[in-house]
């Protein structure tokens, strides 16, 4: 759901983290219409993610705290 | 109905641990993750931390980050929290309560808490 | 420390509306949404509102929230004594990645 690099909707589903890899933050006041977080998976598809779930808020904290402790 | 339904009263000696339980009695955990809550007599409510069953993953609160932690067991629909070092600080009611994981953080359901007491 | 500031108190009489404040910043209620609970003492906390004004089933209308920019509010029109409990606004931070509540409002009915 995504447009010159820009999501447009949120997924539907529930990603489990072990299948992401990474996320990118996606801020509405920066050029898009929504806030959104795009996971990264490992087979390099890019999804958007309602940055409010709270399934989304654990995963961008556990990739955060990974980052941290690299 | 489903209820969160808790371990019983605890009362434990300054520089031991506690291991809280809480089970969803009449369903599962499947969307939901559990987030457990402290209440200090007198005192306000508190975050301590919560997990996603289906992910395994728990998030603390950094307060509590390195003395507390949250797991759980999918196949018994139970979530424990576990918190170490304890100080009379500790003496708290612990409650656990869900939240939905395509809601934003609010918490619908709530056990009716067990009340630990640190005491020498 | 929380950093959701409620007043410690608020009372009206029996029939009257009364408004519960709940000040915070933009990484928590000016980003997220807004619950509010109830709680009478000895018994856990109930969920009154969710996503800023939205109600669960069972809570009646007299209960409404709103928000506007860093701050949020919970009101009850018709006062009556089972009203008489504890309030906190709660909000997720993305500062901190952590559930934050309120300090908490006691409320009485006179």
């Known amino acids: 759901a995504s447009n010159f690099d820009c999501c447009l909707g949120y997924t539907d589903r529930i990603l489990h983290p072990k299948f992401i890899v990474g996320f990118t933050r996606q801020l509405a006041n920066e050029g898009c219409d929504i806030n959104a977080i795009i996971f990264h998976t490992k087979k390099k598809l890019s999804v958007c993610a309602n940055p409010k779930q709270t399934w989304v808020k654990y995963i961008v904290r556990l990739l955060s705290k990974k980052v941290k402790n690299m | 109905e489903v209820q969160l339904v808790e371990s019983g009263a605890e009362v434990k000696k300054p520089g031991s641990s506690v291991k809280v339980s809480c089970k969803a009695s009449g369903g599962t955990f499947s969307s939901y993750a559990i987030s457990w809550v402290r209440q200090a007599p007198g005192q306000g409510l508190e975050w301590m931390g919560g997990i996603i069953p289906i992910f395994g993953t728990a998030n603390y609160a950094q307060k509590f980050q390195g003395r507390v932690t949250i797991t759980a067991d999918e196949s018994t629909s139970t979530a424990y929290m576990e918190l170490s070092s304890l100080g009379s600080e500790d003496t708290a009611v612990y409650y656990c309560?869900?939240?939905?994981?395509?809601?934003?953080?609010?918490?619908?359901?709530w056990g009716k808490g067990t009340l630990v007491t640190v005491s020498s | 420390q929380s950093v959701l500031t409620q007043p410690p108190s608020v009372s009206a009489a029996p029939g009257q509306k009364v408004t519960i404040s709940c000040s915070g910043s933009t990484s928590n209620i000016g980003n997220n949404y807004v619950s509010w609970y109830q709680q009478h003492p000895g018994k856990a906390p109930k969920l009154m509102i969710y996503?800023?004004?939205k109600r669960p089933s069972g809570v009646p209308d007299r209960f409404s929230g709103s928000k506007s920019g860093n701050s949020a509010s919970l009101d009850i029109s018709g006062l009556q004594s089972e009203d008489e409990a504890d309030y906190y606004c709660?909000?997720?931070?993305?500062?901190?990645?952590?559930?934050?509540f309120g300090t908490g409002t006691k409320l009485t009915v006179l």
């Open positions: 996503d800023v004004s």
């Open positions: 709660a909000a997720w931070d993305d500062s901190l990645s952590e559930f934050l």
């Open positions: 309560a869900r939240e939905s994981l395509t809601g934003d953080s609010e918490l619908d359901l």
